[in-house]
Interface confidence: medium
């Protein structure tokens, strides 16, 4: 058999669609794997072939494009379902070929059921809104290409199960939903239902996304180191365990990388010979501000270790800060008998 460049099963593009709704699925070859588009391939004499493997089957079979009302069809590089059925779930393959060239990729398609409140196993995209930041909008996603611009669909927005009308700070504006001033109480799942006519039939597109209200850039500050601080002295005797937490607060910043690290005598802990371990934990507030804790631990501290400089560093897109821990050796209590003897001039 002739060789075909097989890109395998592209699980990164796990496609989920709702049952009994239209779905248009573009062949991923042109989007992610090949350097040319469908038009170029078509004009070069390449043909796009579709086939599929049903759920829990190994057998590849052709897609039936002769169903009543053209339920499944292909248009250029798009596979259309008008509408989907539950048993359309499976792995779909698009193959581009001619007599000398062949390339193919498979991808999973899952047809998902939803209840009357739009609950389903669908993985929901998350849209982040800044808290108390002025008007912000979300747009009904993934509806392009389903109907021509001459068709005017009706769009209904829901929060959870409830139709959005007369909400205090949330206003439906066609494909957009406007938040006049986003608050924590606006967190939740929002659904747009787009209804449009096609060839005497009415179709519905349901799109749900999660809105998460996050810290506003107006309130963002550079990292704040809570610990170590000037109020706490780590006073230890040689042989004791030294535990120093570095706890840092980071304001939420979109796409910011938050970093915390320790230096010991100006070096990273990995670069020095003492037996030090560092454990990290991360927690988030309701607005996704982040508190990172890195605990530096030396099981049996030596008097040399107690003379070193222990500095906690933190960095975000807002800036970099550092704070040294106050570490010192505990002064032993005076030994009474020796002092008494010395006081009497004993040798």
């Amino acid at each position: 058999s002739e060789r075909c460049d097989d890109w395998g099963l592209d699980t990164m593009r796990q496609i989920q669609v709702f049952e009994d709704e239209p779905a248009r699925i573009k062949c991923p070859l042109f989007e992610h794997f090949l350097k040319f588009n469908y038009s170029t391939a078509h004009s070069a004499g390449l043909t796009l072939i579709w086939y599929w493997t049903r759920q829990d089957r190994d057998l590849e079979e052709p897609i039936n494009f002769r169903l009543p009302e053209n339920r499944i069809s292909k248009e250029k590089d798009v596979l259309w379902f008008r509408p989907t059925l539950l048993n359309d779930t499976g792995n779909y393959t698009c193959m581009l070929r001619n007599t000398t060239y062949c390339s193919k990729v498979a991808f999973p398609l899952e047809v998902v059921q939803k209840d009357s409140c739009f609950n389903s196993p669908m993985k929901l995209p998350v849209h982040k809104l800044y808290i108390e930041y002025g008007i912000q909008r979300i747009t009904c996603p993934n509806v392009d290409g389903y109907f021509p611009s001459s068709v005017k669909p009706t769009i209904t927005w829901y929060m959870g199960c409830y139709k959005i009308q007369n909400f205090n700070n949330v206003i439906p504006e066609g494909m957009n939903l406007s938040f006049l001033i986003a608050l924590i109480s606006n967190n939740g799942n929002y659904t747009c239902v787009v209804t449009y006519p096609e060839n005497g039939r009415t179709f519905h597109l349901t799109r749900t996304l999660t809105v998460k209200v996050v810290g506003s850039p107006k309130n963002a500050v550079p990292p704040v180191i809570h610990s170590p601080n000037d109020h706490v002295v780590y006073e230890k005797e040689p042989g004791e365990e030294l535990l120093i937490p570095c706890t840092v607060y980071f304001s939420f910043l979109m796409d910011s990388r938050n970093e915390v690290w320790w230096t010991i005598d100006g070096k990273k802990p990995d670069d020095i010979t003492i037996d030090v371990t560092i454990n990290e934990s991360i927690s988030h507030s309701r607005t996704e501000d982040e508190t990172r804790t890195q605990i530096l631990s030396i099981k049996k501290v030596t008097s040399e270790d107690l003379k070193r400089s222990y500095v906690c560093h933190a960095r975000s897109a807002k800036g970099e800060v550092a704070k040294a821990a106050k570490v010192k050796q505990k002064v032993p209590a005076p030994r009474y008998t020796v002092e008494l003897a010395c006081g009497f001039g004993a040798t």
Epitope: N219, V221, V224, H226, S227, N229, H231, V232, V233, Y234, E235, L243, I244, P245, T247, Y249, S251, S281, D289, T291, T293, I295
Partner: antibody
Framework: QVQLVQSGAEVKKPGASVKVSCKAS????????MNWVRQAPGQGLEWMGQ????????YYAQKFQGRVTMTRDTSTSTVYMELSSLRSEDTAVYYC????????????????WGQGTLVTVSS | DIQLTQSPSSLSASVGDRATITCRAS??????????MHWYQQKPGKAPKLLIK???DLESGVPSRFSGSGSGTDFTLTISSVQPEDFATYYC??????????FGQGTKLEIK
């Protein structure tokens, strides 16, 4: 989930000492200050002091200086509050309470509380 | 030390009423961006429970009928529509500076 579990009720004679324990779970023990707050019968809340478990650093309210000692055992995630030279006015429910974090140094709210330990001082 | 004065010391309300408790600090407990004032609810025989922190930040799990406001020296706790489970004693608390914390003397919310 965060839990603070305190030791049981105590009855003490005037002049004696009492040591109340508070075992923490559900969070990184050494990174949060632990406070002690007491409440005499029918009265309001009174802050006694706090301890930072990582270092053992303590701060005490002026009123209790010299009579109160706060310690911790990091191996069992437990803090202790010992009050000496007890008098009848020390009869109260004693609470341990953890502080939360906030973005600025110095200001903390008491976000989790123990169930309280009743200490009765009576001859 | 900063003193906190709560008023009133007791308050009678009916279910559905709006209830307001104020707390005045002897000096400012605010800096740019936040106020170090917190509110707690305590029911008989129970430990206090944090309701509002940093003057206006509702603690997770606390009903939205509770709200806090104020800055500097004057702070307010408001219950927009009192429910049967809200009858309790309320305390304000400041954590300004280390290491001295103080509480207000408490306000008892009673059924009218």
């Amino acid at each position: 989930q965060v839990q603070l579990v305190q030791s049981g009720a105590e009855v003490k004679k005037p002049g004696a000492s009492v040591k109340v324990s508070c075992k923490a779970s559900g969070y990184i023990f050494i990174t949060y200050w632990m406070n002690w707050v007491r409440q005499a019968p029918g009265q309001g809340l009174e802050w006694m002091g706090q301890i930072f478990p990582a270092s053992g650093t303590t701060y005490y309210a002026q009123k209790f200086q010299g009579r109160v000692t706060m310690t911790r055992d990091t191996s069992t995630s437990t803090v202790y509050m010992e009050l000496s030279s007890l008098r009848s006015e020390d009869t109260a429910v004693y609470y341990c309470a953890r502080t939360d974090f906030y973005r600025y140094d110095g200001g903390y709210a008491l976000d989790y509380w123990g169930q309280g330990t009743l200490v009765t001082v009576s001859s | 030390d900063i003193q906190l004065t709560q008023s009133p010391s007791s308050l009678s309300a009916s279910v559905g009423d709006r209830a307001t408790i104020t707390c005045r600090a002897s000096q400012s407990v605010s800096t740019s961006g936040y106020s170090s004032m917190h509110w707690y609810q305590q029911k008989p025989g129970k430990a206090p429970k944090l309701l509002i922190k940093y003057a206006s930040d509702l603690e997770s799990g606390v009903p939205s009928r509770f709200s806090g406001s104020g800055s500097g020296t004057d702070f307010t706790l408001t219950i927009s529509s009192v429910q049967p489970e809200d009858f309790a004693t309320y305390y304000c608390h400041h954590s300004w500076g280390i290491p001295m914390y103080t509480f207000g003397q408490g306000t008892k919310l009673e059924i009218k």
